[in-house]
Amino acid sequence: SQVSQNCHNGSYEISVLMMDNSAFAEPLENVEDAVNEGLEIVRGRLQNAGLNVTVNASFMYSDGLIHNSGDCRSSTCEGLDLLRKISNAKRMGCVLMGPSCTYSTFQMYLDTELSYPMISAGSFGLSCDYKETLTRLMSPARKLTYFLVNFWKTNDLPFKTYSWSTSYVYKNGTESEDCFWYLNALEASVSYFSHELSFKLVLRQDKEFQDILMDHNRKSNVIVMCGDPQFLYKLKGDRAVAEDIVIILVDLFNDQYFEDNVTAPDYMKNVLVLTQSPGNSLLNSSFSRNLSPTKRDFALAYLNGILLFGHMLKTFLENGENITTPKFAHAFRNLTFEGYDGPVTLDDWGDVDSTMVLLYTSVDTKKYKVLLTYDTHVNQTNPVDMSPTFTWKNSKLPNDITDRGPQ
Amino acid sequence: SQVSQNCHNGSYEISVLMMDNSAFAEPLENVEDAVNEGLEIVRGRLQNAGLNVTVNASFMYSDGLIHNSGDCRSSTCEGLDLLRKISNAKRMGCVLMGPSCTYSTFQMYLDTELSYPMISAGSFGLSCDYKETLTRLMSPARKLTYFLVNFWKTNDLPFKTYSWSTSYVYKNGTESEDCFWYLNALEASVSYFSHELSFKLVLRQDKEFQDILMDHNRKSNVIVMCGDPQFLYKLKGDRAVAEDIVIILVDLFNDQYFEDNVTAPDYMKNVLVLTQSPGNSLLNSSFSRNLSPTKRDFALAYLNGILLFGHMLKTFLENGENITTPKFAHAFRNLTFEGYDGPVTLDDWGDVDSTMVLLYTSVDTKKYKVLLTYDTHVNQTNPVDMSPTFTWKNSKLPNDITDRGPQ
């Protein structure tokens, strides 16, 4: 049943669910700071547009009575609990800044008719794709699968002359929330990635991964995994790796590769890192003092969620349109708005578009260098370094299947 | 976090979750009547044992603010919501008469540390197996798989001389809650049924089912489905059926086959019905006036849940043992107690044992007749009719794979 909204003449509120379970282990104060910084910006923008309205956030905290707290694995019902709390308190805003956990978001759409817009800093899983009132401000799994398929198929670059159609995927179940859903999407038999590959095998044990590195009978030279370099090192250590192995390390929300004085450790030489273009964002922001490089994206997504709310509010108010309508609820998509750190584009399904960056380790400088970028909005790969100083033979990526001649 | 319990000197309460979403579309008044009838009996039994204590039930209703109501598909969080309500109201009893929906029960165990006993009239799915504080009073899916495997392997009865190792399973997603989980268990690749079969295929479309009935190239003669005769008729109609096809219709909670003057329709001649021995229970009970044959088992499970609570209370009080201990929470298993309709046995995992009954349609009398019974407690099949008047050739069940000779 519907919840009455605090969203009427001159007073507009965004309800921010402050979850015990979160996609990133971020103190709730930091999230609150990000939201408040966003509100300051929104107020200024509305005032400049001659819109004398009040904009606030109501923070709805879990009471912690029931749920196992911590990560997203036990978050399924927390979003619904908070929605009930909002409902009882009659404090629903115009927009819900909702759960970051996929389970929680999915359950909210499964169990209720959400007729107001929901913005999420997370909800990475395929099960949250194509929700008509959901906007996701951190790259969802679907976007990753599109990049990988595009890259696998690419065969006309100086450094990649073979199409690939095979892959191993390493997934041991201890991954962070973003990685968990990214790898789930690669594993899922219904996903675009699985659909486009002729061979794919999920490696679940450390030993399976370690054995593949030198296995002459391996079915693919390419291994996709998700995490940071430390995660890879714990798994791979200093083991020898066959020369035509390529590890794709997905580490989207980690700016450390772009920091000054970062040197790539030797174990990264067979690795291509997939990450995102960093902004300088938050480096000198009032609320970002305590944020690690991996946390910036999460806080930024909350801040941008508030700016998106402000953008939509401004657009509708300027057009004299009602905010509490299905039109408003379905409008948070297929648009570009000014985010905290530059333009933010949402696709037709309300999912953020971004520039993904594929890095390699230069054997000369031991630095991470940009090999290519990929624009998720137009599904297009743009080579950057046409003569990379790779570890691989002839400075080209190997074929995904080694030709071993007659057996 | 734990919830304080109304369960101390002289006053003992059972918290009954009254869910909007339920495994059977049973008016909540009927459930309440069953619980109250059970309480009357418990009070009498305790009094007779010289235990002057107060026993009550607190009924916890959903507020209906959030959830899509109705069936179990959108029930995941409703149990947790009610647990929160209990927690806030400080009204937790000694025992929880919990959700009947698998999703809801599973989620409660996933998201919380349930250190008090929970009794369920349902929770049929494999995902609710082996929960240390859960008792299920209606046959769970695991018990069905044990029967089927036992029956498939049986080859030493006058009417079944072939072991079977193949099966089709018809599952179109519109099934009732019990059927949904029974068929899920048969479909699951990890289940005992799947493990023991060499061939199994799930038919999801009506047309697939209909085509198999006369398909010369079918891989099995056996089709398992779940529902009542009407459900089968809608699907099969009066279509011709190959003579060696055997349909197993699982319809555990339906006493109509045993009612006087019931004649089996012609379309049931190729069908074996798996159901349970009916008791006379409820037929002349004060609260059963409005119950259909299919609803009796559900109401009876609630009533028996109360009697089980009373039995455990009596046992612990007579032994001078504390009720609010882990020992009490883990004690609702591996026992037999006096239920409303006779002894009720719970296995080592707190799941009810029962006598399943396999019926066939007599070609002479057009009546449903008992072919065999199966005791889930000892996993044993007991033939009843050694000379059944089957439709199948030589009054024997055919092989599951037709020998078509040289092709």
Partner: antibody, heavy 118, light 110 residues
Amino acid sequence: QVQLVESGGGLVKPGGSLRLSCAASGFTFSSYSMNWVRQAPGKGLEWVSVIYSGGSTHYADSVKGRFTISRHNSKNTLYLQMNSLRAEDTAVYYCARGAGTLNAFDIWGQGTTVTVSS
Amino acid sequence: QSGLTQPPSTSGSPGQSVTISCTGTSSDVGAYSYVSWYQQHPGKAPKLLIYAVTKRPSGVPDRFSGSKSGNTASLTVSGLQDEDEADYYCSSFAGGSTLVFGGGTKLTVL
């Protein structure tokens, strides 16, 4: 009231450097994206660079690698460091505030003139 | 990024209406609802007249209106007044974080 005041322009030789400043007042400077736009004598407007609230920077292709935009939020000041100046960089340089809607500059300074000539 | 195309000049008598066009591509004007128009009097800084294709900042007379069709945006000035004589520039967001200006149109009030 809300205003922007540019300074730092002047005459400089090709290859030289110059640093422009833009002092903001009357609004919460840190909340806005800030831009530099230039106008060569007798010509149209040309966007040069932007710095967003979060500190992210972007440049027109014509100045990429030579110009650096920065901001000092506590001093309410925007900067443009111009290196390797060329004759074609001669223009009036305006500092402009982003209105929060992409590509809309609602407050402009009066401009400061940069002349690159030997 | 090449600029947007505007007519170099146009004119009209007081009280008349004039329309200035601004033609871009499917990557800028056609792709985004972010076209702005600026007015610049000689020796002065530009002033924002229209943003987001059709929106007017407070203080801008409703004689100024914006529209867009396909890859072309338009500024219409109705009820021309002497003080409307100025240069008019369009600009469009062009993806990434880049924006492009038009070459400008000189409006003369006859």
